[in-house]
């Protein structure tokens, strides 16, 4: 599965969610929905 | 008003393969990912997986790793799944949705109307 | 992968009497204090409708009679007063990790 990586927000590693503080806008992905500041 | 529209019904035979588009309008197609969820007949739930119409990448269920391909048009803001090596087990409703990230205020969630895969010999 | 596991597979109830619902997921959908757990109703012929996200929240529209209660491994929704519209299959799910998963379903009927 891919890695899904931002500046922000969170990241997949071995499908698992790891969240940060910060939050994601939605100008740098589409929103996956269901999540706290998910995009990719 | 946000509304995913898809494909119609698909009759296939055992090992064939099929491709379900949902069509997006009423938004920007590029905000939302678009997920997949099939049932089969009678049963419950099941995710398999989801695609990016901003960046093309997709996230599937291991359980379809190898038979399942969701795309994206965004000259036309459809999104395609595409299953392949069908068998009987494949037949079910297969829809299309979009949801909001919890942090947005409000939650909502859009469902195409499905669409009906049987998959016989 | 985490499996949700629903209860009852049925449930038969009086009109204006509660009807509670249970799911169990194999491993806690908490994350940094939030339950990733919702919760949607499905009518015969029609998609799932989101009714209750992060364990809580209502989604938009539901009415306030749906609730939802829970945290890490053990939830439950409540429906406070059962009206006929209500007659659906209803389903939990986790959002804390890819793959997504549903619990089974249960199936609520008016007694």
């Known amino acids: 599965d891919a890695e899904f990586r931002h500046d922000s927000g969170y990241e997949v590693h071995h499908q698992k969610l790891v969240f940060f503080a910060e939050d994601v806008g939605s100008n740098k992905g589409a929103i996956i929905g269901l999540m706290v500041g998910g995009v990719v | 008003q946000v509304q995913l529209v898809q494909s119609g019904a698909e009759v296939k035979k055992p090992g064939a393969s099929v491709k379900v588009s949902c069509k997006a309008s009423g938004y920007t197609f590029t905000t939302y990912a678009i997920h997949w969820v099939r049932q089969a007949p009678g049963q419950g739930l099941e995710w398999m997986g989801f695609t990016s119409p901003y960046s093309g990448v997709s996230n599937y269920n291991q359980k379809f790793k190898g038979r399942v391909t969701m795309t994206r048009d965004t000259s036309t803001s459809t999104v395609y799944m595409e299953l392949s090596s069908l068998r009987s087990e494949d037949t079910a409703v297969y829809y299309c949705?979009?949801?909001?990230?919890?942090?947005?205020?409000?939650?909502?969630?859009?469902w195409g109307q499905g669409t009906l895969v049987t998959v016989s010999s | 992968d985490i499996v949700m596991t629903q209860s009852p597979d049925s449930l038969a109830v009086s009109l204006g009497e509660r009807a509670t619902i249970n799911c169990r997921a194999s491993?806690?959908?908490?994350?940094?204090?939030?339950?990733?757990l919702n919760w949607y109703q499905q009518k015969p012929g029609q998609p799932p409708k989101l009714l209750i996200y992060?364990?809580?929240k209502q989604g938009t529209g539901v009415p306030d009679r749906f609730s939802g209660s829970g945290s890490g491994t053990d939830f439950t929704l409540t429906i406070s007063s059962l009206q006929a519209e209500d007659v659906a299959v209803y389903y939990c799910?986790?959002?804390?990790?890819?793959?997504?998963?549903f619990g089974g379903g249960t199936k609520v009927e008016i007694k």
């Open positions: 491993e806690s959908v908490d994350n940094d204090r939030i339950s990733f």
């Open positions: 799910q986790q959002s804390k990790e890819f793959p997504w998963s």
């Open positions: 992060a364990a809580t």
């Open positions: 949705a979009r949801f909001d990230n919890f942090d947005r205020g409000y939650v909502r969630d859009y």
